[in-house]
Interface confidence: medium
């Protein structure tokens, strides 16, 4: 069963100072996002007891496996269903605590009824304040039955629940007709699964026989100990004011347990701690009581003492229960109550036996849950005791359960029975997540679902480089860590797997399911260095660089030139993806503005070192285009091009820019200045023959601005002159025959 | 769903006895208080008598020593004898389905019961 | 015994009207009252119960209040199948039925 435990602090009489607390013994519980572990949660639920709403009550975490609830504003505000909830996946278990308001018309004898299946339950509600009506029972919230008020018992109203089934199971609730329902008296009836000491799916499996007050669980067959009991079967007491399976909580306080109900897992309930009684746990056990309610009788024989937590403490010589056992008698020595091993293995088993006549190795022997008997193989025989070791064949999940341990002398027998868990070492469900990578290494989640049991001890990774037939390496990390796995051939792929195991020999489970991560390429070294650039225009720059010389073949897949804007504190990238590429023209800059540049070589997704920056100022933007220009052939060598002013212009015009490039050439275009703005015409001398040209042009104030339309004209061919006279401008001009 | 249907009733001398019975189905009979209620021809309602899950009876002060209510758990009915059956005992029987939260909130159609000469 | 007194004996009104039924009780019964109608040659019909309750599948327009001796069963926007004998009982002591309230259409 989980170790978990509902204490509910009793201390009435100030509503304030009422508190539930809900403790885990469980490995990692509570911790929450951890992934081992959900959260533990403890909370008031009205589905069935419904109380008037007020301020809402304060949760405090202490620690990863503890959650107190306080809050309590009034007394009605305690009135009702409490439940928490711990431990994870199928282990996930809720503890119940109702608790009674001390002032209400009717109060239970006991609050918590566990029955075996089949049983009679008998409710019963003591009548605290009268009323002369009928009394109303309730299962679950909805009316169950009904009482006439004359119908009470030496003033207790009983209700009789013959042949209980499991889905009898539930809150009950006895009430005065028209009484308020914080007036009732709340009960838990917790039915078993199984008939009496039976338990398993079909109720086939016999209960390991429960001590002081223990249950035995219909599904597992593990007893649930009462507080202040732990063991297999319950059979060894805590030290006064501990609790948990392990005995390893504390009771808060200096009065120990005193004022605290305790409720376990289904299906014990609830009851006092050890030693104490009454509805508020406050009384201490009258003499000859002791255990969780003072339920348990200790009718020690041979001088022994009864103690109100421990029971019977037996005089020298004398041992057992009621001190009925002769120290004569052989005794089973020392052998743990529970043991663990994982599945397939092959465990030894040590049992240790006294008494007189000594045991020897024959005497003792091994019983396994389907009833098989072991001898042991051997022996160590001391001064005090016989050690018999037993060789266990190789474990399945069948062998869970109850084993027995067994000496048999002339002076009579003893028997030690013990719980075997079988746990299923862990499988991975899922392969490792890739979280970076890098070329010579990878980073790596180990952290995945599993089948099978835990906790998790040790997480190795396992990794080889794809379709290889090497041998696999292997890193043994921390479960909650991520893992680096190092000194790895760069732009390769690898094949990752990881293991996990648990505690014990042979915990190591399969590898769970491949993955494939890749390396990352190699970073580039060579730094290269920015030859030179030039203004092509207000928004365009021309770059080129060049890269140091080295043996071998180049490691990368281009460049990126990147241009820092400084004033904007943007950052300008352009990929140049041929390796070979020596010069770029970037286009679409912002004129007027200081840019920083540089250059780096690139692989795949790696950069390699930047060049040294430059700094290069764009001209700011110059006057619009020039409007209508128009081209009109003159001759066999010249064409002459008008054109209208740009309009709304920010200045002066200092010049015009003619650019002339034959139409469908290879070769760069021309650019010819007209060096007197005033002009709306220019004659473009010194052109070939029956020739097309491509004609465009731009003004300049202090920078160069937009290009006009392009036009096409042809040179005349044979000689042939046009009509007309010409007026020309004074233009540079420069001939075109190349 | 519920149902409650009485029979029984008819044409009796004065001091005659008369046992009506009420047959239930649709709920759990034996977690349920029962009444018997009456109505004389053109008159209003009047409780007869009632009986808890347990047994526990109460009758009218009307009626008392000579209507005796009972019930058989085991065949979900619920009973009426009546004897020393007087004129003014002529009327309606119904039997109801007791409190669930005070008031009968179930019904048969019921029987009439003629006590005449 | 606990005597329950119902007023008015007979009560008319029309389709869309309130109206208002009123029982006495002879001594305090907290709240222990049920409302019952009944139509002519039907079983009578549980309303109401705990004097404000009411039962489910009976409609809004039916409402009760009151505690001790003195109850109130209200019938807001009177419809056809409302026009009916309406009944008291008290459950505090045994069980009395009130002599009746007639509901006729006027």
């Known amino acids: 069963a989980v170790d978990l435990t509902l204490l509910a602090n009793l201390r009435l009489t100030d509503p304030q100072r009422f508190f539930l607390t809900c403790v885990s013994g469980e490995a990692g519980a509570g911790r929450g996002s951890d992934a081992w572990g959900p959260p533990l949660l403890l909370e008031k639920d009205d589905r069935i007891v419904r109380t008037p709403p007020g301020p809402p009550l304060r949760l405090a975490r202490n620690g990863s496996h503890q959650v107190t609830l306080r809050g309590f504003s009034k007394p009605s505000d305690l009135v009702g269903v409490f439940s928490c909830v711990g431990g994870a996946g199928a282990r996930r278990t809720r503890v119940i605590y109702v608790h009674n308001s001390p002032g209400a018309h009717l109060l239970p004898d006991k609050v918590t009824h566990t029955v075996n299946k089949g049983d009679t339950a008998v409710l019963s509600a003591r009548v605290h304040k009268e009323k002369q009506t009928d009394v109303i029972w309730k299962s679950n919230g909805s009316y169950f039955y009904t009482l006439d008020w004359h119908e009470a018992q030496d003033g207790r109203f009983l209700l009789q629940l013959p042949n209980v089934q499991p889905p009898s199971s539930g809150i009950y609730s006895a009430t005065y007709l028209e009484a308020s329902p914080l007036g009732s008296a709340f009960f838990r009836l917790i039915v078993r699964g199984c008939g009496a000491g039976r338990w398993g799916p079909g109720c086939t499996k016999e209960c390991p026989g429960c001590l002081h007050g223990g249950v035995c669980h219909d599904h597992d067959g593990e007893c649930v100990c009462p507080p202040g009991f732990t063991g297999t079967r319950c059979e060894q007491a805590c030290r006064e004011g501990r609790f948990g399976q392990s005995c390893q909580e504390q009771c808060p306080g200096i009065s120990g347990c005193r004022g605290l109900t305790f409720c376990l897992p289904d299906p014990y309930g609830c009851s006092c701690g050890s030693g104490w009684r009454g509805s508020q746990c406050q009384e201490a056990c009258a003499p000859g009581h002791f255990g969780a309610d003072c339920r348990l009788q200790c009718q020690c024989q041979n001088g022994g003492t009864c103690d109100r937590f421990s029971g019977c403490v037996c005089p020298s010589g004398w041992h057992g229960v009621h001190c009925e056992k002769s120290d004569r008698i052989p005794q089973i020595l020392n052998m743990a109550s529970e043991l663990e091993f994982n599945l397939e293995t092959m465990p030894r088993i040590n049992c240790a036996a006294a008494g007189n006549p000594f045991p020897v190795r024959g005497s003792i022997e091994l019983r396994k849950p389907d009833g098989t008997v072991l001898l042991s193989t051997k022996a160590i025989v001391e001064p005090e005791k016989t050690t018999a070791e037993f060789e266990v064949p190789r474990l399945v999940l069948a062998d869970s359960g109850f084993w027995e341990c067994r000496v048999s002398t002339s002076g009579g027998q003893d028997s030690r029975r013990f719980k075997v868990n079988v746990k299923v070492p862990p499988v991975p469900l899922a392969a490792p997540r890739l979280l970076t990578k890098q070329s010579r290494q990878l980073v790596v989640s180990p952290l995945v679902s599993f089948s099978g049991d835990g906790p998790i001890s040790t997480v190795r990774l396992h990794y080889r480089p794809q379709d290889s037939t090497m041998d696999w390496s292997t890193i043994v990390v921390d479960p909650s860590e991520n893992v680096t796995l190092m000194n790895l051939r760069p732009k390769t792929g690898y094949s990752v797997r990881v293991q996990l195991s648990r505690p014990g020999e042979g915990g190591e489970g399969a590898w769970g399911p491949p993955t494939l991560m890749t390396t990352d390429c190699p970073e580039p070294l060579l730094q290269p260095w920015l030859e030179g650039w030039h203004v092509e225009g207000t928004d365009r720059l021309r770059v080129s660089w060049s890269l140091p010389l080295v043996p071998g073949p180049l490691v990368g897949d281009g460049f990126l030139l990147r241009l820092w804007d400084g004033t904007r504190g943007q950052e300008r990238r352009e990929n140049v993806s041929s390796p070979q590429a020596r010069t770029a023209l970037l286009t679409g800059l912002t004129p007027g503005t200081h840019y920083q540049l540089d250059v780096q070589l690139y692989h795949c997704t790696l950069l390699g070192p930047a060049s040294p920056p430059a700094h290069v100022l764009l001209p700011p933007s110059g006057p619009p285009a020039p409007r209508h220009l128009h081209a009109q052939a003159l001759s066999d060598s010249e064409i002459q091009l008008t054109w209208k002013h740009p309009e709304a212009l920010p200045g002066p015009i200092s010049k015009y820019v003619v650019e002339v490039q034959v139409a469908g050439g290879a070769g760069d275009p021309l650019w010819i200045d007209v060096d007197r703005p005033e002009e709306t015409s220019t004659i473009i001398r010194g052109l070939n023959a029956s020739t097309r040209y491509l004609f465009r042009m731009r003004a300049s104030i202090q920078g160069l601005g937009d290009w006009s339309n392009t036009v096409e004209e042809s040179t005349l061919g044979n000689g042939l002159q046009a009509e007309g006279p010409v007026q020309e401008s004074r233009a540079a001009e420069e001939g075109l025959d190349q | 769903e519920v149902q409650l249907l009485e029979s029984g009733g008819g044409l009796v001398q004065p001091g005659g006895s008369l046992r009506l019975s009420c047959a239930a189905s649709?709920?759990?009979?034996?977690?349920?208080k029962m009444w018997w209620v009456r109505q004389a021809p053109g008159k209003g309602l009047e409780w007869v008598s009632?009986?808890?899950?347990?047994?526990?009876?109460h009758y009218a002060d009307s009626v008392k020593g000579r209507f005796t209510i009972s019930r058989d758990n085991s065949k979900n009915t619920l009973y009426l004898q009546m004897n020393s059956l007087r004129a003014e005992d002529t009327a309606v029987y119904y039997c109801?389905?007791?409190?669930?939260?005070?008031?009968?909130?179930?019904w048969g159609q019921g029987t009439l019961v003629t006590v005449s000469s | 015994d606990i005597q329950m007194t119902q007023s008015p004996s007979f009560l008319s009104a029309s389709v869309g009207d309130s109206v208002a039924i009123t029982c006495r009780a002879s001594?305090?019964?907290?709240?222990?009252l049920a409302w019952y109608q009944q139509r002519p040659g039907k079983a009578p019909k549980l309303l109401i119960f705990?004097?404000?309750t009411l039962q489910s599948g009976v409609p809004s327009r039916f409402s009760g209040s009151g505690s001790g001796t003195e109850f109130t069963l209200t019938i807001n926007a009177l419809q056809p199948e409302d026009f009916a004998t309406y009944y008291c009982?008290?459950?505090?002591?045994?069980?009395?039925f009130g002599q009746g309230t007639k509901l006729e259409i006027k």
């Open positions: 705990s004097a404000s």
């Open positions: 649709g709920f759990t009979f034996s977690y349920y």
């Open positions: 009982q008290q459950l505090s002591r045994y069980s009395t």
């Open positions: 001594q305090d019964i907290s709240r222990f």
């Open positions: 109801a389905r007791g409190p669930v939260s005070s008031g009968g909130d179930y």
């Open positions: 009632s009986i808890s899950p347990g047994g526990w009876t």
